[in-house]
């Protein structure tokens, strides 16, 4: 008799793939044309990334540091109208992309929470949650919650409103904190909150340190669903050396939880890489004409168009990973086990019941290393085979689908490998 299948866990939509943050509509769409109507035309691109949710905005009216002139129910006319927003929601729904609205109140000001008038702002947020839930949004994001007095109790209240409307709605909170205790205390009072933080960016970016950061986080947060990013709003390039971008994409997509990216992460967009650009929100490089001010400033390999045509690009890697993440049970909700490997490496397995299993080996170092996989650390349910098939490498030159002998596995500097192998009873 075949062994009984393990019961599938309840899967919410945000468990099934990545979230994509567009914090600045105008920068995302390029010079002079950033509105909701224009964003509708970019939904096909988001579909091609296979992201499951779009974290949008803030879009509401906010006069810098002026509570009275901040209206969380009104869309700033610069971004479009309520009708434009409704149309966007409808179009996104047709493409199975959920829309999460950022309601961080004073997004144009110094203190995002108007520190002196927290209570009146909190009331505004409460009203806004009700209003936008009725309008059809799939969830909310609030950032900089470390600057919100009594954050835990406000978040609990807002989560109740969100979940009270539907269990299928999501609340995301963002913090600049990288302190695990602070993060855990914010999570403890909110069972379904997704929290983005700077936790992973407070790193020496070595295999050993990253492994300990990830395992400590997972141990501290127990069996709750978590999210993975390097910050609450910034680009990966702001926190990572360029040579680790591919490695981190592979890691963020294969850790247990929801990967959260900012627009441009998929092409390695840099903050203020080009003259005159704002650091916070660099212009998305759709093609070579995206930055007309300085001819020749943008080369094809920096752009969506150029990278779409190159199977070895960062964008192609992102699409491949996003595809795997959204369809493979072991990556969707599989168990996670790390194990010992060579110095400078971080290696782990994702497995679910009798489904295909995945092995991730990440070389954070700038030297070539033997993987030195030591499966003795693994439970019997997650043992390693002698060979595994290469799904992808973050570096060019390896043949996808080729079987690799795990005992003789070597990694190039900064190389990450995603390998698959079947369940064997």
């Amino acid at each position: 008799r075949a062994p009984r299948c393990r019961e599938l866990p309840a899967q919410k939509w945000w468990h099934t793939g990545a979230l994509y943050r567009i914090g600045d509509l105008q920068a995302f769409q390029g010079h002079g044309s950033g509105n909701l109507a224009g964003l509708k035309g970019r939904l096909d691109y988001l579909s091609s990334l296979k992201v499951k949710g779009l974290v949008l905005g803030p879009l509401h009216k906010n006069q810098k540091d002026d509570v009275a002139q901040t209206d969380l129910l009104q869309i700033d006319p610069n971004f479009g109208s309520k009708e434009d927003f409704d149309n966007l929601l409808q179009s996104a729904k047709k493409k199975s992309i959920r829309v999460i609205l950022d309601l961080t109140p004073n997004y144009r000001g110094e203190n995002l929470w108007f520190s002196t008038q927290v209570d009146s702002v909190a009331t505004k947020v409460k009203d806004a949650l009700e209003f936008w839930l009725q309008a059809g949004v799939d969830g909310f994001q609030v950032r900089d919650i470390e600057n919100l007095k009594d954050a835990s109790s406000f978040l609990a209240e807002w989560e109740n409103i969100t979940k009270g409307f539907s269990e299928d709605r999501l609340l995301i909170a963002g913090t600049n904190s990288s302190d695990l205790q602070q993060i855990v205390s914010l999570l403890e009072s909110n069972k379904d909150l997704l929290l983005t933080s700077s936790y992973l960016s407070d790193s020496s970016f070595t295999g050993e340190h990253t492994k300990s950061l990830v395992t400590q986080y997972l141990n501290a947060t127990g069996n709750r669903w978590c999210s993975w990013s390097l910050s609450q709003a910034g680009l990966l390039t702001s926190f990572l050396p360029a040579q680790l971008l591919r490695l981190y994409q592979l890691m963020l997509f294969t850790l247990p939880g929801t990967p959260v990216f900012s627009y441009g992460d998929e092409i390695g967009l840099k903050a203020a890489a080009l003259p005159g650009q704002p650091v916070e929100a660099p212009v998305m490089l759709w093609d070579e004409s995206s930055f007309p001010d300085i001819p020749g400033a943008v080369s094809a390999n920096m752009t969506v168009k150029g990278q779409s045509e190159d199977p070895g690009s960062l964008l192609s890697l992102f699409r491949q990973l996003s595809d795997q993440r959204s369809k493979e049970r072991s990556l969707l909700h599989g168990d996670f086990h790390t194990f010992s490997s060579g110095p400078g490496l971080f290696s782990y397995i994702r497995h679910w019941d009798q489904n295909e299993r995945f092995l991730v080996v990440l070389n954070f170092g700038d030297v070539g290393l033997s993987a030195g996989l030591q499966a003795s650390d693994l439970p019997a349910s997650a043992s390693l085979p002698t060979k595994a098939d290469l799904v992808l490498s973050t570096q060019p030159g390896r043949e996808e689908g080729s079987p690799l002998e795990l005992e003789r596995l070597k990694l190039e500097p900064h190389e990450g490998l995603l390998l698959r192998f079947p369940y064997v009873a």
Epitope: G342, P343, D366, V367, G368, L369, P396, L411
Partner: antibody, heavy 118, light 108 residues
């Protein structure tokens, strides 16, 4: 068996460039890295740079502007190029294999002598 | 760069004696990345001990290595005439790789 063999010009005039070829046998350059190390007469060893199996290169920053390492996997050859040589570049130049075990050089060539003199 | 200082610069020992030479790093090195080479006069260096304490193929068991952090050592439990050579330590803790200046061992 595993072998590396350096071949170079022997004598180079000051300010000229140097090219040394390391020809390997018994292993593939698609699976191993190759380092370059030099040793001035009567002195210690100085690391110059490395080319990994995938083709990525790293150099000693003190010499970076003058150095370049490349390879031809099909010919099993690694090439070291060094520009603007001075008399203190006189040394025995070695290539050595890295087997990805922890950044050590497990097999060395016999070396080639380079003398910089007019 | 991580500078390796070897001591003594040279030493002399009689056959059968125990010999220890040290290698000190200016900043910490992972034990996985500290190695020793033997070079005899007129020959190229040979890998002798890798990752602090593992003997390379063909190296006699009288050799051993130990250490951690910034301090490492190579020991010969009972020196023999064929051990006369210069011994170099080498580390990796980020580029560049560096070598110590060597310890020259003479046999009386």
């Amino acid at each position: 068996q595993v072998q590396l063999k350096e071949s170079g010009p022997g004598l180079v005039a000051p300010s000229q460039s140097l090219s040394i070829t390391c020809t390997v046998s018994g292993f593939s350059l698609t699976s191993y890295g190759v380092h370059w190390v030099r040793q001035p007469p009567g002195k210690g060893l100085e690391w110059l740079g490395v080319i990994w199996a995938g083709g990525s290169t790293y150099y000693n920053s003190a010499l970076m502007s003058r150095l370049s390492i490349s390879k031809d996997n099909a010919k099993s050859q690694v090439l070291l190029k060094m520009s603007s040589l001075q008399t203190d570049d006189t040394a025995m130049y070695y290539c050595a294999r890295d087997n990805y075990g922890g950044v050590y050089l497990d097999v060395w060539g016999a070396g080639t002598t380079v003398t910089v003199s007019s | 760069e991580n500078v390796l200082t070897q001591s003594p610069a040279s030493m002399s020992a009689s056959p059968g004696e125990k010999v220890t030479m040290t290698c000190r790093a200016s900043s910490s090195v992972s034990s996985s990345y500290l190695h020793w080479y033997q070079q005899k006069s007129g020959a190229s260096p040979k890998l002798w001990i890798y990752s602090t304490s593992n003997l390379a193929s063909g190296v006699p068991a009288r050799f051993s290595g130990s250490g951690s952090g910034t301090s490492y050592s190579l020991t010969i439990s009972s020196v023999e005439a064929e051990d006369a050579a210069t011994y170099y330590c080498q580390q990796y803790s980020g580029y560049p790789l560096t070598f110590g200046s060597g310890t020259k061992l003479e046999i009386k």
